[in-house]
């Protein structure tokens, strides 16, 4: 038996009862997997909100855009998308919200055209260091990935391995230097407390970096110097207190960067003076007139651009004999 062929003008759906029959035989070039909708004209397959527990084996060879969102995949094994013949055209793969908690080494191997990958909204307790590089070689074959979307992939506290979540993600990004061509990286909403200092230096092609809605307190040890192509840096909704001179100078030196800093708890004391001076001068920060102080209490809601040096003082540190308990 064969599933209905996809029409050039609309999506076709396969009947669920055909699933077992189809998966046992080699895929026909134009067939559509059970529980999926296919459009050959749009080169698109959508298997959305179907509670799938594994990636369909009988994906059509023409697929360029594959949506596997809202499923229950749990684990993405090595070669999860390896097929004979390979899915040579697959360029965009969206796996968001599919309850993935483990992505194994080589999960995306044999996808030579894969440019966009979205793993957002999956509780990734176990992301293999070789999930994107495919091998444990010190230098892997370059990945074709240009966009990697990893928003809200942090698992609940009780499901985390006994290791740094930031470190696990960064290890996967840096393994084998496979992602040298990556242009967009989204890591929003991941409870990141810090950014490992080596991560950005090894992603030299980045154009867009989204670190919004994390818990970053400082950028002191992060270097942006090599990111000469960076166009947008999203740091909204973090825990940043101040940006220091080294960071300011590096950002100022990037020729077409736009930095977004809204909704951080800026501490408007004497350490903020350099940042305020820079903000008044720079074109780098978008919406800079919206930035306000959070601390100290007497400065709350004051607009950073309206502050002058007299406003930015630090309370003197009392000698121990004068401090109260």
């Amino acid at each position: 038996s064969s599933s209905p062929t996809s029409s050039a003008s609309s999506f076709s759906s396969s009947a669920p009862f055909l699933a077992s029959a189809v998966s046992a035989q080699p895929p026909l070039p134009d067939q559509c997997p059970a529980l999926c909708e296919c459009s050959e004209a749009a080169r698109t397959v959508k298997c959305v909100n179907r509670n799938l527990t594994e990636v369909p084996t009988d994906l059509p060879a023409y697929v360029r855009n594959l949506f596997l969102t809202g499923n229950q995949l749990a684990v993405l094994p090595a070669g999860a998308f390896a097929r004979r013949p390979p899915l040579a055209e697959l360029a965009a793969l969206n796996l968001s919200g599919s309850r993935l908690d483990e992505v194994r080494a080589g999960a995306f191997e044999h996808l030579p055209s894969l440019r966009q990958l979205d793993l957002s909204h999956n509780p990734l307790a176990d992301l293999s260091p070789f999930a994107f590089s495919g091998s444990n070689a010190s230098v892997s074959a370059p990945s074709p990935l240009v966009e990697l979307i990893l928003n809200h992939i942090v698992p609940p506290e009780d499901e985390r391995q006994n290791r740094s979540f930031e470190g696990m993600v960064v290890a996967a990004l840096l393994a084998g230097r496979a992602l040298q061509g990556l242009r967009r990286l989204e890591l929003a909403s991941n409870h990141f407390l810090y950014l490992p200092r080596d991560v950005l230096a090894q992603l030299p092609s980045l154009r867009h970096l989204d670190l919004s809605n994390n818990s970053l307190v400082s950028l002191t040890y992060v270097s942006f110097r090599n990111l000469t192509h960076l166009e947008s840096l999203h740091l909204e909704d973090n825990a940043l207190k101040v940006l220091h001179n080294g960071t300011l100078a590096e950002l100022q030196g990037l020729p077409h960067i736009r930095v977004f800093l809204d909704n951080n708890p800026w501490v408007c004391d004497c350490h903020m003076a350099d940042m305020v001076t820079w903000l008044k001068e720079t074109e780098v920060v978008q919406g800079k007139d919206r930035l306000t102080c959070a601390y100290p209490e007497k400065m709350r809601n004051r607009v950073l651009l309206e502050l002058n040096s007299a406003d930015l003082d630090c309370d003197p540190i009392l000698p121990p004999s004068l401090q109260t308990s």
Partner: antibody, heavy 117, light 108 residues
Framework: EVQLLESGGGLVQPGGSLRLSCAAS????????MSWVRQAPGKGLEWVSY????????SYADSVKGRFTISRDNSKNTLYLQMNSLRAEDTAVYYC??????????WGQGTLVTVSS | DIQMTQSPSSLSASVGDRVTITCRAS??????LNWYQQKPGKAPKLLIY???SLQSGVPSRFSGSGSGTDFTLTISSLQPEDFATYYC??????????FGQGTKLEIK
């Protein structure tokens, strides 16, 4: 009402110097970056120079780099363009404009600079 | 340097016509593009900023679209006061602006 008024244009010989001024009113001058843009007779617009709100950052078009200097006096609400080593191809109407995040949202009426012997 | 190329260089149209002017950048500039109108002997006036945002006070018959390298300015129904020269301008690089060569819109 935002107003920008250029002055200082005129006839100057090749190799000579001229200083243009732009008096600003109707907005908080020290809060805005500013730019100079020029337009040769019968030609299109050419961006010339940029200065940040407190003068810490400046930039220039390649065609004027090393010859023109942009500056500002926030206490006088005035923008300047010092033009040295003038050439015939610098002949143009020079406009000052308020620069807001890459957008030139207000312009003066311009002052004509003629470089000729 | 980023080059901006406008087309056509000149255009004849009648009152009430729908007119489209295009601007092409020599590399991707995201949405960092503005449009200006200039009438003879006058300073340029900002119409559209950030590719598609209408400047306050500008009639709604003006609209802008595009991103990357290709942009358009559209006047939905030409009015007598719209006959002028139109310029696009990019601001992808901080502090380094470039204009298109202009499109002269004339009465047919």
């Amino acid at each position: 009402e935002v107003q920008l008024l250029e002055s200082g244009g005129g006839l100057v010989q090749p190799g000579g110097s001229l200083r243009l001024s732009c008096a600003a009113s109707g907005f908080t001058f020290s809060s805005y970056a500013m730019s100079w843009v020029r337009q040769a007779p019968g030609k299109g617009l050419e961006w010339v120079s940029y200065i940040s709100s407190y003068g810490g950052y400046t930039s220039y078009a390649d065609s004027v780099k090393g010859r023109f200097t942009i500056s500002r006096d926030n206490s006088k609400n005035t923008l300047y363009l010092q033009m040295n080593s003038l050439r015939a191809e610098d002949t143009a109407v020079y406009y000052c404009a308020r620069y807001h995040s890459g957008v030139l949202d207000y312009w003066g009426q311009g002052t004509l600079v003629t470089v000729s012997s | 340097d980023i080059q901006m190329t406008q087309s056509p260089s000149s255009l004849s149209a009648s009152v009430g016509d729908r007119v489209t002017i295009t601007c092409r950048a020599s590399q991707s500039i995201s949405s960092y593009l503005n449009w200006y109108q200039q009438k003879p002997g006058k300073a340029p006036k900002l119409l559209i900023y950030a590719a598609s945002s209408l400047q306050s006070g500008v009639p709604s018959r003006f609209s802008g679209s595009g991103s990357g390298t290709d942009f358009t300015l559209t006047i939905s129904s030409l009015q007598p006061e719209d006959f002028a020269t139109y310029y696009c301008q990019q601001y992808y690089y901080h502090y380094l602006l470039t204009f298109g060569q202009g499109t002269k819109l004339e009465i047919k």
